[in-house]
């Protein structure tokens, strides 16, 4: 009992502290931290004995999106969708769950993260893990051999996510893919161009796109003496090089995965290299690697890719990185991953990556897995890691203390005197019918000050004020909320004036 009383006192004190910090306009981060502490204290307090024991929360790894977060999300999506459309993509959608059989055998070690559904209808179902496998199923099922499409939807993974770093069990993916038989590397180059366009437009900081090729990796493993059966598991070790040192990776390969130390050293000579087209040229001259058919094909394609990337003006954003070994089993050719760069602490140091924000590659065999005759449809695509981007954009806006509008209301219909509700209702209806985004307060006789305050808080730029005199004169007082400047506008000109002031096209086409 004493413990509960102490906790109640702490909750009260912490609540006062939070209110005080808000009044003092303390930093957003400090307020956020103290609010989080308050919530943790309240959680320990639990419900009153009189209240139910059920803890009201979203499931692990999920979250609600507040209006503010949704506003950020919609802005991000808008940038992405405009880019996808600019590149001529169509849009598709697929079910949120698939037959379990569709997803099995496509993700290698990651298959354990697939959510299976308990279904009474007899079908074994799973929530989709990504948008790529459902896309391949869609192509095979509809016998399509040629499509450029984008798909933005939620996917599900039974991960143990670090939600503070923008990782969840339910999260959005934004995918763009080109399916079809085309000349080498042209669609691949366009995917990289799209990735760069989106990341530049979002202004989330400097980035680098690492590029490699599955065939180069496989060829390199073969000449270094890795047995076929160990390719995938060694790949997953190599892929950790962006997070841990070569020593740690080598220890894992030798200690845990049973690779001979000299084989690991040979791999180390390759995977620690990264550069541009000159590294491709250098490896084409490598006496061992150039003798491997797969690696040679991969290097030839990468050389061509760099030519196209130069023409697209993005070669400075691309790094050929032999340690890139993306985890998914279905990649067959070029693979790439975009990472945001931290500014180096000292000049002369290499930039540090702070996590993947986009990735993709070529997967020429995936559609064939669904075709009874194994007919292949070559595909290449990319996926934008929007959850991480949402987190970064939200943090940036918080740091800048930018106010984000969560509605698009252009005008509030207000009254300066009592008994004008009917007139407000008539006017707001006229505005809605004309395509104007308008609101009114749900009170018969709201105070003018309260109406103006509402506009300030919601970021509404204009107020249309009705008064007795204005009604007689056939005018409406149009007030700018920021400048407080008021002008009388003839009622028949009001729609046009609001559209002019808010930069909206004059006709709803």
């Amino acid at each position: 009992m004493a413990e509960r009383a102490a906790l109640e006192e702490l909750v009260k004190l912490q609540g006062e502290r939070v209110r005080g910090l808000k009044q003092q306009k303390a930093s957003a981060e400090l307020i956020e931290e103290e609010v989080a502490k308050l919530l943790k204290l309240k959680a320990q307090l639990g419900p009153d004995e009189s209240k139910q024991k059920f803890v009201l929360k979203t499931p692990k790894g999920t979250r609600d999106y507040s209006p503010r977060q949704m506003a950020v999300r919609e802005k991000v999506f808008d940038v992405i969708i405009r880019c996808f459309k600019r590149h001529g993509a169509e849009v598709i959608d697929t079910p949120v769950f698939e037959l379990k059989e569709t997803l099995m055998g496509k993700y290698g070690e990651d298959s354990k993260l697939i959510y299976d559904l308990k279904d009474q209808g007899g079908e074994l179902l799973s929530l989709r893990y990504d948008l790529t496998v459902p896309f391949a199923r869609y192509l095979a099922m509809n016998k399509l051999t040629n499509i450029k499409r984008y798909h933005i939807a939620k996917v599900y993974r039974r991960d143990n996510p670090a939600m503070t770093r923008g990782r969840y069990r339910e999260f959005y993916q934004c995918d763009f893919d080109i399916a079809g038989n085309f000349d080498p590397m042209i669609p691949d180059a366009e995917c990289l161009k799209i990735m760069c366009e989106i990341l530049s437009s979002l202004q989330i900081g400097d980035f680098l796109v690492k590029v490699n090729d599955r065939r180069i990796l496989d060829g390199m493993f073969a000449i270094c003496g890795v047995s076929d059966s160990k390719f995938r598991t060694i790949c997953s070790s190599v892929d950790k090089l962006d997070k841990v040192s070569w020593e740690e990776v080598k220890n894992e390969m030798v200690g845990e995965k049973g690779l001979a130390p000299e084989v690991a050293d040979r791999i180390g000579d390759y995977v620690q290299q990264h550069g541009g087209v000159s590294l491709v040229e250098q490896l084409l001259q490598d006496p061992k690697l150039s003798q491997n058919k797969q690696a040679l094909e991969g290097l030839g394609d990468l050389k061509l890719l760099f030519e196209y990337l130069t023409l697209f003006g993005i070669d400075d954003k691309i790094s050929f990185d032999l340690s890139l070994a993306r985890g998914l089993d279905y990649y067959t050719g070029v693979i790439y991953e975009a990472v945001l760069l931290q500014t180096p602490a000292q000049a002369g140091e290499e930039p540090l990556g702070v996590g993947s924000v986009a990735a993709g590659g070529r997967y020429d065999g995936l559609v064939g897995m669904f075709d009874p005759k194994g007919r292949k449809v070559p595909c290449v695509g990319l996926s934008i890691g929007v959850e991480r981007i949402f987190s970064i954009v939200e943090q940036r806006l918080e740091a800048l203390e930018e106010k984000i509008r969560t509605t698009e209301t252009q005008v509030l219909v207000a009254s300066a005197q009592k008994k004008l509700l009917e007139e407000r209702l008539k006017l707001v209806s006229e505005l809605w019918d004309a395509g104007i985004k308008a609101e009114l307060l749900y009170k018969k006789n709201p105070k003018l000050l309260n109406q103006l305050q509402y506009c300030e808080e919601a970021g509404i730029p204009l107020v249309a004020i009705i008064g007795e005199q204005e009604l007689k004169d056939g005018v409406i007082k149009l007030r700018s909320v920021t400048s407080r400047e008021e002008v009388d506008v003839r009622r028949e000109d009001l729609v046009e004036e609001i559209k002019r002031r808010t930069g909206q096209p004059l006709c709803i086409c």
Epitope: E9, L13, E33, K37, K40, L41, A162, T164
Partner: antibody, heavy 120, light 107 residues
Framework: QVQLVESGGGLVKPGGSLRLSCAAS????????MSWIRQAPGKGLEWVSY????????KYTDSVRGRFTISRDNAKNSLYLQMNSLRAEDTAVYYC?????????????WGQGTLVTVSS | DIQMTQSPSSVSASVGDRVTITCRAS??????LAWFQQKPGKAPKLLIF???NLESGVPSRFSGSGSGTDFTLTISSLQPEDFATYYC?????????FGQGTKLEIK
């Protein structure tokens, strides 16, 4: 019962580095803010740094900012303090401490302390 | 930074005595104050938190009071095991600071 055990202290020359560790047991480590508090020989207590439950927030006292780094590994129930560019005035017993009721900056459980001596 | 000043810096008393130690904050800290006891060669031990709440397992002869800037720790009837150094600490804002300590000695 709640237990905090520090390790990693010792004698180091000025400008040198040490990494202190604190192994926690007997409670759900990942729910608690944790801190390092030090006490110079014969002197009072000084709150050096803290880290939030999920590592989102960290703070350092002015005299160590930029030289010390606090971190934690919830999977290993461990708290760390990386100390670089050590100075004679960093000589102290370093205690690992747990926050009261998970988030209140009052230490309700302390380790036995580990002595760091900075001397040439 | 918030400065914490304890008085007296040392006090001599006998078993059974009533002892009061005071702690003053350089600015208002509401009730964000704790009291600790430390014996030589040992880690501090929490006695009182948020000015007046007794930590579980601490004898009821210890009590705390105050708010704002002035706080007191009272030991109603000194026991032999109470001879130690006592520290106050503010938990209002970082850096969280301690008083310089009050050494309680046997008379």
């Amino acid at each position: 019962q709640v237990q905090l055990v520090e390790s990693g202290g010792g004698l180091v020359k000025p400008g040198g580095s040490l990494r202190l560790s604190c192994a926690a047991s007997g409670f759900t480590f990942s729910d608690y803010y944790m801190s390092w508090i030090r006490q110079a020989p014969g002197k009072g207590l000084e709150w050096v740094s803290y880290i939030s439950d999920k590592s989102r927030y960290t703070k350092y006292t002015d005299s160590v900012r930029g030289r010390f780094t606090i971190s934690r590994d919830n999977a290993k129930n461990s708290l760390y303090l990386q100390m670089n560019s050590l100075r004679a005035e960093d000589t102290a017993v370093y205690y690992c401490a747990r926050y009261l009721y998970q988030v209140i900056a009052i230490a309700d459980a302390w380790g036995q302390g580990t002595l760091v001596t900075v001397s040439s | 930074d918030i400065q914490m000043t304890q008085s007296p810096s040392s006090v001599s008393a006998s078993v059974g005595d009533r002892v009061t130690i005071t702690c003053r904050a350089s600015q208002g800290i509401s009730s964000w104050l704790a009291w600790f006891q430390q014996k030589p060669g040992k880690a501090p031990k929490l006695l009182i938190f948020v000015a007046s709440n007794l930590e579980s397992g601490v004898p009821s002869r210890f009590s705390g009071s105050g708010s704002g800037t002035d706080f007191t720790l009272t030991i109603s009837s000194l026991q032999p095991e109470d001879f130690a150094t006592y520290y106050c600490q503010q938990a209002e804002s970082f850096p969280y600071t301690f008083g310089q300590g009050t050494k309680l000695e046997i008379k």
